[in-house]
Interface confidence: medium
């Protein structure tokens, strides 16, 4: 699996989407887990409703929510009030029995550019106001890892 990067702003919410084949994963519950180290286990954070037919109902664990569009084939995870410690490698999983298939590997990055909170009226930089008109809107962006980028830096 390639790793997809999702970037969110500290203090705001981040939505992570994991598309999948709805027929292949029919009847399966889903889960969101956090990878502990490069070769460590994936620790369950939250999973969809125990009854698969109710997978569309949002389930929370702390500040993390999960909901599953089983017809459209999209698992959505929301990380609310994103904090620096939320950064790291995660997985979207499809569960069957005691096994779990990886739907997507996700690297969550928490961004914090200090210019993002400036009000346009307070600007001391010329010609920048267009960057601030949506400063408090919840944003997310996803991309694949650049060649040479690694989700886990080598430990010293």
């Amino acid at each position: 699996h390639n790793t997809t990067v999702f970037q969110g702003v500290a203090g705001q919410s981040l939505q992570v989407s994991c598309p999948y084949d709805s027929m292949k994963h029919w009847g399966r519950r889903k889960a969101w887990c956090r990878q502990l180290g490069e070769k460590g286990p994936c620790q369950r954070v939250v999973s969809t409703h125990n009854l698969w037919l109710l997978s569309f109902l949002r389930r929370w664990n702390g500040s993390t929510a999960i909901t599953d569009d089983t017809l459209g084939g999209t698992l959505t995870i929301t990380l609310r009030n994103l904090q620096p410690h939320d950064a790291g490698l995660y997985q979207c999983q499809s569960l069957h029995g005691s096994e779990a298939d990886t739907l997507r590997k996700v690297l969550v990055e928490v961004l914090a550019d200090p210019l993002d909170h400036r009000d346009a009226g307070d600007l001391w930089f010329p010609g920048e106001s267009e960057s601030f008109e949506d400063a408090h809107v919840e944003h997310s962006i996803s991309r694949s890892l650049l060649e040479g980028e690694i989700p886990f830096p080598p430990t010293s």
Epitope: Q7, L111, P114, S131
Partner: antibody, heavy 115, light 112 residues
Framework: EVQLVETGGSLVQPGKSLRLTCATS????????LHWVRQSPEKHPEWVAH??????????YYAESVKGRFTISRDDSKSSVFLQMNSLKEEDTAIYYC??????WGQGTLVTVSS | DTVLTQAPLSVSVTPGESASISCRSN???????????LYWFLQKPGKSPQLLIY???NLASGVPDRFSGSGSETDFTLKISEVETEDVGVYYC?????????FGPGTKLELQ
């Protein structure tokens, strides 16, 4: 005129505490995110801590090297930001700058931790 | 952490000549809304750092236009087109994309 004036730096022994104060004027303090950045002699600046505005619930962030030992806080009514430094180590020796990490920087206050 | 490296660490320039300083990041600094959170500072001897360039290529208020910034997601350049005596000091690149914020080791610019 924008001013940031840091005070409270001194010579202290390892394990002791120190409280730095940054008094500001000349800009809309309550809206500005503020930081402490330190710089050891002949070294590059190192970000230490960050406090957001009231609208962001005064959220705080810390460098790993000071987490659990340093506390950043602010008093909007006095346009001041503080850095409470506990369990000081020799490697905390540096000039400490109060800054918005962009255009506003104080002149710095020297903290020396030595036995 | 995001690690920034700079080259050269020291540069000696004749007034009126141009100078270039390179900064490289071990991670992409391209963030939301295609903003690249790479900043350049100049620290003159005995002074606090002062902002020169914000978000890779934008000139901060009051900074002479002989300074310019460019780059990609991980490789950045600060160029001074005609160095003047007041440009002496240490130039730092910094990333403010993700915590912890980090600064490069600095490039000392001296006059020949």
């Amino acid at each position: 005129e924008v001013q940031l004036v840091e005070t409270g730096g001194s010579l202290v022994q390892p394990g002791k505490s120190l409280r730095l104060t940054c008094a500001t004027s000349g800009f809309p303090f309550s809206n500005v995110w503020l930081h402490w950045v330190r710089q050891s002699p002949e070294k590059h600046p190192e970000w230490v801590a960050h406090i957001k505005a009231k609208s962001d619930n005064y959220a705080t962030y810390y460098a790993e090297s000071v987490k659990g030992r340093f506390t950043i806080s602010r008093d909007d009514s006095k346009s001041s930001v503080f850095l409470q430094m506990n369990s000081l180590k020799e490697e905390d020796t540096a000039i400490y700058y109060c800054t918005d990490i962009l255009e506003y920087w104080g002149q710095g206050t020297l903290v020396t931790v030595s036995s | 952490d995001t690690v920034l490296t700079q080259a050269p660490l020291s540069v000696s320039v004749t007034p009126g000549e141009s100078a270039s300083i390179s900064c490289r990041s071990n991670k992409s600094l391209l963030g939301i809304r295609d903003i690249t959170s790479l900043y350049w500072f100049l620290q003159k001897p005995g002074k606090s750092p002062q902002l020169l360039i914000y978000r890779m290529s934008n000139l901060a208020s009051g900074v002479p236009d002989r300074f310019s910034g460019s780059g990609s997601e991980t490789d950045f350049t600060l160029k001074i087109s005609e160095v003047e005596t007041e440009d002496v000091g240490v130039y730092y690149c910094a990333q403010f994309l993700r915590y912890p914020y980090t600064f490069g080791p600095g490039t000392k610019l001296e006059l020949q």
